[in-house]
């Protein structure tokens, strides 16, 4: 996360963003928070973004004032009118597209002073993969799924039994190319399985990194999948 | 409580113009978008296009651009639909409706309860 | 603009029945579909939003689901309320379109 204080007027307040990614086609949070004041038509909350000449969005004394937003994200962001009195200036974004990446700056005024603080966001594609028994194979096999990765993951099966183990010969991993032509689908197949093991089929790209677990025994399959956005480091 | 409510039925001839009210309550005007449906007899819904009261921001579907014109009066919480150059095929019930998160364009979810226009010589 | 198709355009089912009722989008990928249902004489009713997000005080019956270019409407155990016409809305351009509307009657 990234913690700012204002430099101009007399007082400063902390504004903390934290570094996030949004999933192309759908919304996306950008975090910002600040020093809450008790008086809502003196906070005014600012978001910026590197290269657009017009504002994110703006709201202030109580209500939001597009006057002066930037085409590019007209109707597209709201923030948590309700939760601004407790120093909450995230901002919601409808349909996040790959150019809203980049780097914005929330900015924060109050009865207490100003602040602002940046915020570095990424925009891809990522899902929860989800892994089978491949009833097409000859042999006994695994089949991972995932609909939607940008850019290009990687894919990288392990077991819990044989930890160290490089499953990469005996896997095949391919990428197909959604209608859209952005997004891919990633579908690994891994081959000649032993049942009473629990495999796990991990994709990641530099946005996030997700895990389908299976184990297969004689009485039934067990399934367990997790997705982990990768927030970079403040700076 | 969300309420729109609309102005009366309208009669018009081929080539006149129609104008639809539809008087928000319960709700910051300004802060949410109002779209306008319309519907003909028998047939779907038909999307014409929506705008944020608090900036005057208008989209259109194309179909209807260059007869059609979305205003706001924010000192009576009003949204207005103008048609022209009206045809028969115009005649339809014409219905607002707001649109949900705020400044930001979600999906509609309140109605108003509807206007017919019936454009007929 | 994106159109969307919606499928089929009619269908007849009895109380009890499940129903599924389709939306394909012409182009682009995005999570923005809502469905709706109308009576006769009536205005649209909201019932789902954001592919799969229940209206509240829309009972549970009613699930969405979808990703890409392809929503679905299911109606799990048909009830005599639900008889009625349900449309798509893809709202997430610009630009929104409607379904051409599936009308769900009585058997």
């Known amino acids: 996360f990234i913690i700012g204080f204002g430099i101009s007027g007399r007082h400063s307040i902390t504004v903390t963003t934290l570094t996030s990614a949004g999933n192309i086609g759908e919304d996306g949070i950008l975090s910002c928070t600040f020093e809450p004041d008790i008086k809502l038509s003196d906070i005014v909350i600012q978001w910026l973004k590197e290269g657009v000449t017009g504002l994110v969005h703006e709201f202030k004394k109580g209500k939001d004032d597009l006057s002066d937003q930037d085409e590019m994200f007209r109707g597209r962001t709201a923030v948590f009118a309700d939760q601004v009195i407790v120093g909450n200036a995230s901002l919601r974004l409808k349909n996040v597209q790959l150019t809203d990446a980049g780097t914005y700056k929330c900015y924060i005024i109050t009865s207490k002073g100003k602040g602002n603080a940046k915020l570095e966001y990424k925009t891809g594609a990522f899902s929860i993969p989800e892994v089978n028994v491949d009833s097409n194979a000859s042999s006994e096999s695994l089949r991972c799924e995932a609909p939607r990765w940008f850019p290009q993951p990687t894919v990288v099966w392990a077991s819990q039994v044989d930890q160290g183990a490089n499953f990469s010969e005996v896997s095949n991993t391919s990428f197909e190319l959604n209608p859209e032509n952005v997004t891919m689908k990633v579908v690994s197949v891994l081959y000649n399985v032993t049942i009473n093991t629990t495999y796990s089929c991990m994709i990641e790209n530099d946005i996030a990194k997700a895990t389908g677990d299976i184990r297969v025994t004689d009485s039934e399959i067990k399934r367990q999948s997790h997705l982990q956005l990768l927030n970079s480091k403040a700076s | 409580e969300v309420q729109l409510v609309q102005s009366g039925a309208e009669v018009k001839k081929p080539g006149a113009s129609v104008k639809v009210s539809c008087k928000a309550s319960g709700y910051t005007f300004t802060s949410y978008w109002i779209g306008w449906v319309r519907q003909a007899p028998g047939q779907g819904l038909e999307w014409i296009g929506d705008i944020y009261p608090g900036g005057g921001y208008t989209n259109y579907n194309e179909k209807f651009k260059g007869r059609v014109t979305i205003t706001r009066d924010t000192s009576t919480s009003t949204a207005y639909l103008e048609l022209s150059s009206l045809r028969s095929e115009d005649t339809a019930v014409y219905y607002c409706?707001?649109?949900?998160?705020?400044?930001?364009?979600?999906?509609?979810?309140?109605w108003g309860q509807g206007t017919l226009v019936t454009v007929s010589s | 603009d994106i159109q969307m198709t919606q499928s089929p355009s009619s269908l007849s089912a009895s109380v009890g029945d499940r129903v599924t009722i389709t939306c394909k989008a012409s182009?682009?990928?995005?999570?923005?579909v809502a469905w709706y249902q109308q009576k006769p004489g009536k205005a649209p009713k909201l019932l789902i939003y954001?592919?799969?997000t229940l209206q509240p005080g829309v009972p549970s019956r009613f699930s969405g689901s979808g990703s890409g270019r392809d929503y679905t409407l299911t109606i799990s155990s048909l009830q005599p309320e639900d008889f009625a016409t349900y449309y798509c809305?893809?709202?997430?351009?610009?630009?929104?379109?409607f379904g051409q509307g599936t009308k769900v009657e009585i058997k």
């Open positions: 182009q682009g990928f995005n999570k923005y």
């Open positions: 954001y592919t799969s």
């Open positions: 809305l893809q709202y997430g351009n610009l630009l929104y379109a």
């Open positions: 409706a707001r649109l949900d998160g705020s400044s930001y364009r979600g999906a509609m979810d309140s």
